[in-house]
Amino acid sequence: EPPTACREKQYLINSQCCSLCQPGQKLVSDCTEFTETECLPCGESEFLDTWNRETHCHQHKYCDPNLGLRVQQKGTSETDTICTCEEGWHCTSEACESCVLHRSCSPGFGVKQIATGVSDTICEPCPVGFFSNVSSAFEKCHPWTSCETKDLVVQQAGTNKTDVVCGPQDRLR
């Protein structure tokens, strides 16, 4: 009785259970009543990452420097090339097909999380007691200066963009 289902790493064709080709190899010929599945290794710059019955291997991804990309991990016959972005840039998607410049946090905002090759800068508004007076991809919100610890008094209140201005205490006459 011909099989209707096959074991793991097999596929059904012409009422035969044929072995799938292992990762890194492509199908050249299905198995028959007389022969085992015939597979061949993927060529240079090609890969297949699963047990498969593909007649063509996939091309390795090209990390295009014109798009700000560089190779993070070279592909093998079983894995695709992994691209990442040049310093100061990050991927626009999970597939990392192009890069954009890391965003800077405007004055009044500080860096909550520094950008990586795959994620953009995350900014947060400076809360009361903190400020940022620069546009930066690295600077966090800084705490206002504590005038008291310097034996000074606040002459001008701080904002989310400016530090407090301290001055000498008025002398009692």
Epitope: V28, S29, E36
Partner: antibody, heavy 115, light 112 residues
Framework: QVQLVQSGAEVKKPGASVKVSCKAS????????IYWVRQAPGQGLEWIGG????????NFNEKFKSRATLTVDTSISTAYMELSRLRSEDTAVYYC????????WGQGTTVTVSS | DVVMTQSPLSLPVTLGDPASISCRSS???????????LHWYQQRPGQSPNHLIY???NRFSGVPDRFSGSGSGTDFTLKISRVEAEDVGVYFC?????????FGGGTKLEIK
Amino acid sequence: QVQLVQSGAEVKKPGASVKVSCKASGYTFISYYIYWVRQAPGQGLEWIGGINPRNGGTNFNEKFKSRATLTVDTSISTAYMELSRLRSEDTAVYYCTRHGNGVYWGQGTTVTVSS
Amino acid sequence: DVVMTQSPLSLPVTLGDPASISCRSSQSLLHSNGNTYLHWYQQRPGQSPNHLIYQVSNRFSGVPDRFSGSGSGTDFTLKISRVEAEDVGVYFCSQTTHVPWTFGGGTKLEIK
């Protein structure tokens, strides 16, 4: 239905070459190997080799590797077997065959080598 | 090369009787994938060979169930439970586990 139709009988002199054709129909030609087998008069069967029409890849019986050439023309779904430097012992019926979802044979081509 | 030895060479049988043909290989035909690529053919006079059984015991579509195959390793048998007139011809075993593929010398079945 699957059919393999071979070329007609050939008479050749020793030292000559012969090219036998096998036209396939009724299935996707590139999906299955074509194999060649011969049978000398009153004798058993002898495997010559096979060719994968998808990529032209071949496998051979070492005995025939230096004299047999297997080719295909996918545009007309035809396989060819050429045997060179013929000798009298090559007198035989030559069959093409295909297997996978059943086994199919050509009708055979008689090749006679005689001076 | 793997040598396939068939016996008997000739097999005279009475119609309706059983028949048995033996095939021995010079080395095991068990493939690394677990299959055994031993097959049986029938060749009627003046015709191309016709496959009966593949991988020891699997009948091809349209082959009568009076034909059966058995065996393992190096020792194989083709049985015909009740011989009919149309069964006359030469029977070959062959192996496709090892390259080159090889055939037995044939067993001629005839009616007594």
